[in-house]
């Protein structure tokens, strides 16, 4: 990973594009913090394993999180 | 559609300054990290600095450190590029590009919108 | 700092023809930050491929991406009178910073 101690932030850039929940491997957030002062939502495709940095005040991202947040409650017992 | 647009070149004399900006429309500007690449006559690509979406982080080239600026106004839109103590070398085509949507340091989208470039010559 | 060489420097073919271009760096880059660029005479340059292997936005598929570790490929199928042009690799690497290589000019022989 090219990652220095100088970089403070993960996200380059952040998308609004909505994700299709069946296509993610895996939905991280990563809270604020001395490191970097905004949320930071990244986004792992089931293709190819792409990462992708997504928008936290975007509508779609919100949708996405409410419906992954919603699949997972279904699935704990 | 998506467009960059540079301007603020010209010629100046070595150990002078200028000011170069990039205008951006089509897209949500303050979503997307920015680049600075530049083209001398003739040769490749060399790419300068970039600036993160939000201005968190900037990083630059080694031959334009303490000497070059990036930064950007999300609410005009608008790259700059601030160079002082401009040598005969930093003559060159200087673009601005966009960092693509989602990029991060775990997975790179590359450069996906250019402008079409502005030209400063230092020359004494 | 890793360093990238392109070759052939120059690669001379017809139209209909298939071109390989190469790329190796000098130490392992991990394929989601390589990338290749087209550039024409007096124009901008334009992303053709990001990930190694993934297509830009319009980008059509005669042109391929390949490889990992040291060594990729740019794969033009069969080459189109428009795809006489320089291209570049590029990689992002630690510090952060974005290296291109010094490009491969394909040309009408």
């Known amino acids: 990973v090219p990652l220095s101690r100088t970089v403070r932030c993960t996200c380059i850039s952040i998308s609004n594009q909505p994700v299709n929940p069946r296509s993610l491997e895996k939905l991280e957030i990563i809270p604020a913090s001395q490191f970097c002062p905004r949320v930071e939502i990244i986004a792992t495709m089931k293709k190819k394993g792409e990462k992708r940095c997504l928008n936290p005040e975007s509508k779609a991202i919100k949708n996405l999180l409410k419906a992954v947040s919603k699949e997972r409650s279904k699935r704990s017992p | 559609q998506m467009q960059l647009v540079e301007s603020g070149g010209g010629v100046v004399q070595p150990g002078r300054s200028l000011r170069l900006s990039c205008t951006a429309s089509?897209?949500?500007?303050?979503?997307?990290?920015m680049h600075w690449v530049r083209q001398a006559p003739g040769k490749g690509l060399e790419w300068v600095a970039v600036?993160?979406?939000?201005?968190?982080?900037?990083f630059y080239v080694d031959s334009v450190k303490g000497r070059f600026t990036i930064s950007r106004d999300n609410s005009k839109n608008t790259l700059y590029l601030e160079m002082n103590s401009l040598r005969a070398e930093d003559t060159a085509i200087y673009y601005c590009?966009?960092?693509?949507?989602?990029?991060?340091?775990?997975?790179?989208?590359?450069?996906?919108?250019w402008g079409q470039g502005t030209t400063v010559t230092v020359s004494g | 700092e890793i360093v990238l060489t392109q070759s052939p420097g120059t690669l001379s073919l017809s139209p209909g023809e298939r071109a390989t271009l190469s790329c190796r760096a000098s130490?392992?880059?991990?394929?989601?930050?390589l990338a290749w660029y087209q550039q024409k005479p007096g124009q901008a340059p334009r992303l053709l491929i990001y990930?190694?292997?993934s297509r830009a936005t319009g980008i059509p598929d005669r042109f391929s991406g390949s490889g990992s570790g040291t060594d990729f490929t740019l794969t033009i199928s069969r080459l189109e009178p428009e795809d006489f042009a320089v291209y570049y690799c590029?990689?992002?690497?630690?510090?952060?910073?974005?290296?291109f290589g010094p490009g491969t000019k394909v040309d009408i022989k």
């Open positions: 590009a966009r960092e693509g949507d989602g990029s991060g340091i775990y997975y790179y989208y590359g450069m996906d919108v």
């Open positions: 089509g897209f949500t500007f303050s979503n997307n990290g």
């Open positions: 600036i993160w979406f939000d201005g968190m982080n900037k």
């Open positions: 130490q392992s880059v991990s394929s989601s930050y």
């Open positions: 990930g190694a292997s």
């Open positions: 590029q990689q992002y690497g630690s510090s952060p910073i974005f290296t």
